[in-house]
């Protein structure tokens, strides 16, 4: 049952004399393993013998032996799947049909394969895409229906006979479906490749030429143009004529339209290959090109730069940067349309020529206020001198200059005055917008650069102001030099260092902390009485009568200041002692008599002693001696002694007379 045999292999295999052929082949014999295989060349079925006749190229026997003459042909298969064959070398007369006679235990099959062997190596075949456009990548394919393991070959690409630089990718196929060798080349053709010959060359392993295929490239491209100009340097003066010609060096397909462009914009009514410009003006300076189109698109020539030369136009000045800050750098640029470019420049500041400045740019490394003003320039080239344009204004900004704090008051300023100060400045750009004052925050803040100090203090010494725009400039501080009466006047005892005793030498000093002006006069007074006009008040020998309340006054041209009253205390021993008697120095017996020891002492008497007419001290120590009832025997002279921390003093004798009462006399 023939339906049991299934074969897969290429239908036809190609080779050439001396090469080899490799026949990939698979089969299935479903009833069992292959027992016999014969490879016939052009087999013919003999009906009489019911067998195939023909040249036997290969025969396998049951015992597996292969005759030695069959070495050229090899069966590389097996008993159930593989039926691959190799013929090496292959000859021209091997062309025709190969018959694979297969036999299993119960079945037989003849499988036919076509073999085409040429006398010489056949050429490969180049495949091109349907259309090739310039600069678009295409893949060129070179295909050869041949591949054999025993006969290595290579495919090489040539352009106009020269090997191509691009790397080709070669692949081979030896499968039951197909047998081939293929080379693929990726390539971006340029318009210049149009009409060029591309060759795919078949070579053996040693690089020996075997065969080739060639094609002519048909590269579609936009028109390629050349522009010619008269005069050739394209430099003319106003009023001259210019001719430009456009030549098409290549176009595929043929061109359809022509136009001219200036600075990228199409020129109206210029549709021929020649452009004539008569009596040119400077406005016609620019970049010219011609444009020719075909079905691929427009092609443009290189640009011709037409220069119409003219004298410089009125110039303008560009300043980098205005306003400028004093001390910064500034650059001025003179801009003037001219052809050729100006070779010389003349610069003006406020209408006056700036000496030594002949360049297009003027650089001032350190701007000062006097640099402000109008800058203009004049440009000059070989055709003439331009006009001076309107110029540009340089604004130089700087902090306020020469700031001074000015005292508006008539001098001198006295403590308590209202002082007015103004903050003045010489110049400022931009304008002064505010003022600041030192000391900070001491007074009501002024507004328009005038500071009013109400009731100025003696201690307000120095003031400074600043005028501010974008920056603050401080004036040097000014001294108010406030004049005031002497301050902190007080009496100070210089000597003695300890307490004052009667008879001491005493010096009092009139002190004050400060005075402005410094020239002062002193006055000492006691109880409204003037004592002296020196800073010191001296007592050679102080007496208790000098004690009391002293004040000193210090005055200057502004006023006078008094000290607090200062009490001078003189210490002395008890003096002026006397004994006084109450009710009198004659007292009737039985009545009461009081003797008092009166004295003048500083400090007061602390201790009293009483004596009788016999200078006998009495046992009484208080200021008063009370006799009650008084007796006639108490009559006599008494005296007292007073003691304080300084010393003692005694009184003179005072006589007490005690007389008899009427009762006593009556009894007598």
């Amino acid at each position: 049952d023939s339906s049991k045999w299934v074969f897969e292999h290429p239908e036809t295999l190609y080779a050439w004399e001396g090469a080899c052929v490799w026949i990939p082949c698979t089969y299935r014999a479903l009833d069992g393993d292959l027992e016999s295989f014969i490879l016939f060349h052009n087999p013919e079925y003999n009906k009489n013998t019911s067998k195939f006749d023909g040249t036997r190229l290969y025969e396998s026997t049951k015992d597996g032996k292969v005759p030695s003459e069959q070495k050229r042909v090899q069966f590389l298969g097996d008993k159930n799947k593989n039926c691959t064959l190799s013929i090496h070398p292959v000859h021209l007369n091997d062309s025709g049909q190969l018959g694979l006679r297969m036999e299993s235990k119960t079945e037989k099959w003849m499988e036919r394969i076509h073999l085409n062997v040429s006398e010489r190596p056949f050429p490969p075949h180049i495949q091109l895409p349907p259309e090739i456009q310039e600069s678009q990548e295409v893949t060129l394919t070179c295909l050869l229906n041949f591949s054999c393991y025993g006969y290595p070959i290579q495919l090489q690409w040539l352009l106009e006979g020269v090997p191509m630089r691009q790397a080709a990718v070669t692949s081979t196929s030896l499968t039951i479906k197909s047998v081939f060798t293929r080379s693929e080349l990726k390539f971006s053709p340029q318009w210049s490749h149009h009409g060029k010959i591309v060759t795919c060359q078949l070579q053996d392993a040693d690089g020996k030429f075997l065969s080739n295929d060639t094609v002519q490239l048909n590269v579609k491209h936009t028109p390629k143009l050349e522009i010619k100009v008269t005069p050739s340097d394209a430099i003319v003066r106003e009023g001259d004529s210019v001719t430009m010609t456009c030549e098409v060096s290549s176009s595929n397909p043929e061109y359809t339209t022509v136009s001219w462009l200036k600075d990228g914009t199409s020129l109206k009514k210029q549709n021929t290959f020649t452009l004539n410009l008569r009596e040119v003006t400077k406005d016609q300076s620019g970049k010219y090109c011609c444009q020719v189109s075909n079905d691929v698109g427009p092609g443009r020539s290189e640009e011709v730069f037409l220069q119409v030369q003219y004298a410089p136009e009125p110039s303008t000045v560009q300043i980098l940067h205005s306003p400028a800050v004093e001390g910064s750098q500034v650059e001025f640029l003179c801009m003037s349309l001219a052809n050729p470019l100006p070779t010389n420049y003349t610069w003006y500041h406020n209408g006056k020529e700036m000496q030594g400045r002949t360049e297009e740019k003027v650089h001032i490394p350190k701007i000062l206020p006097w640099h402000a003003g109008t800058y203009s320039c004049v440009a000059e080239n070989i055709l003439g001198t331009g006009q001076r344009g309107p110029g540009a204004e340089l604004d130089v900004q700087y902090p306020p200059k020469k700031v001074t704090t000015v005292i508006q008051n008539p001098m001198p300023i006295r403590e308590g005055d209202t002082v007015t100060l103004s903050c003045n400045y010489n110049s400022s750009n931009p304008s002064v917008t505010r003022y600041e004052w030192k000391p900070h925050g001491a007074w009501e803040e002024p507004s328009l650069g005038v500071l009013k100090i109400q009731n100025v203090g003696w201690d307000n010494t120095t003031i400074a102001c600043a005028a501010c725009n974008s920056w603050c400039s401080w004036a040097s501080p000014v001294a108010l030099n406030v004049q005031y009466a002497p301050r902190d006047v007080r009496v100070r005892k210089i000597k003695p260092l300890s307490e004052i005793h009667s008879g001491n030498s005493v010096s009092l000093q009139c002190d004050f902390s400060s005075s402005h002006p410094k020239e002062v006069q002193f006055f000492w007074e006691k109880n409204g009485r003037l004592l002296g006009k020196e800073s010191q008040l001296n007592f050679d020998s102080i007496s208790p009568e000098d004690a009391g309340s002293y004040s000193c006054w210090v005055n200057n041209s502004i006023g006078q200041t008094a000290s607090k009253a200062w009490t001078l205390e003189v210490l002395y021993a008890p003096r002026r002692l006397r004994v006084s008697m109450s009710p009198g120095d004659q007292v009737m017996e039985g009545k009461s008599a009081t003797l008092t020891c009166e004295s003048d002492a500083n400090p007061p008497v602390s201790h009293y002693t009483w004596f009788d007419w016999n200078n006998q001290s009495l046992p009484y120590h208080s200021q008063k001696l009370r006799l009650e009832p008084v007796k006639v025997q108490h009559s006599g002279a008494y005296w007292c002694q007073g003691t304080n921390s300084v010393g003692k003093g005694r009184s003179p004798l005072s006589t007490l007379t005690v007389y008899y009462s009427p009762e006593t006399i009556g009894r007598r």
């Epitope: 505010r434 000391p439 925050g441 009501e444």
Partner: antibody
Framework: QVQLQQPGAELVKPGTSVKLSCKAS?????SYWINWVKLRPGQGLEW???????????NYNEKFKSKATLTVDTSSTTAYMQLSSLASEDSALYYC????????WGQGTTLTVSS | DIQMTQSPASLSASVGETVTITCRAS??????LAWYQQKQGKSPQLLVY???TLADGVPSRFSGSGSGTQYSLTINSLQPEDFGSYYC?????????FGAGTKLELK
């Protein structure tokens, strides 16, 4: 008599802002600078800046320029200090005080910055 | 900016003693210096301004002196209520700056 009144304390979270107030009375508010002073334990007094209510002019200690913003409301005779992007180091006692020599002081506001 | 350097940082003294605190400015402040006293938990209080003028109500035992860059505060016959912290501050220009302070303690 001259008085500057400040709230006793403010508690705020880190990263937030706070506006401290200082209410003035007993004098012409627009005629004297209002100063703000910071006191941190063991760190002494630090001047933050001042504002002149009559014009709104301000001066700042460079250290506090991006931290404090001083404003006034003359109608209510109140000065304000806004502190932004608060962090723990902004926790302190903040005083307002009058004039260049600080003749009258508020009682101070204790600001605590804590999460 | 003008820096103020105050010394000493701390000082121990007894009632009745005389003490002096000094302040040095990094530039001439033209006598525009103030002295403050601060007690624990209280606002600072102005004692002296313009270097030597006593503020209203300040006892005469306090006195200020100095000029240019060197200034001092003297307290004669210390009283119990004088103990606390003292600060100097200039107001010649902005920024106003304070001294670091002097802590006056009872010995």
């Amino acid at each position: 008599q001259v008085q500057l009144q400040q709230p006793g304390a403010e508690l705020v979270k880190p990263g937030t802002s706070v506006k401290l107030s200082c209410k003035a009375s007993g004098y012409n508010f627009t005629s004297y600078w209002i100063n703000w002073v910071k006191l941190r334990p063991g760190q002494g007094l630090e001047w933050i800046g001042d504002i002149y209510p009559g014009s709104g002019n301000t001066n700042y200690n460079e250290k506090f320029k991006s931290k404090a913003t001083l404003t006034v409301d003359t109608s209510s005779t109140t000065a304000y200090m806004q502190l932004s992007s608060l962090a723990s180091e902004d926790s302190a006692l903040y005083y307002c005080a009058r004039r260049g020599y600080l003749d009258y002081w508020g009682q101070g506001t204790t600001l605590t910055v804590s999460s | 900016d003008i820096q103020m350097t105050q010394s000493p940082a701390s000082l121990s003294a007894s009632v009745g003693e005389t003490v002096t605190i000094t302040c040095r400015a990094s530039g001439n402040i033209h006598n525009y210096l103030a002295w403050y006293q601060q007690k624990q938990g209280k606002s600072p209080q102005l004692l002296v301004y313009n270097a030597k003028t006593l503020a209203d109500g300040v006892p005469s035992r306090f006195s200020g002196s100095g000029s240019g860059t060197q200034y001092s505060l003297t307290i004669n016959s210390l009283q119990p209520e004088d103990f606390g912290s003292y600060y100097c501050q200039h107001f010649w220009s902005t920024p106003l700056t304070f001294g670091a302070g002097t802590k006056l303690e009872l010995k």
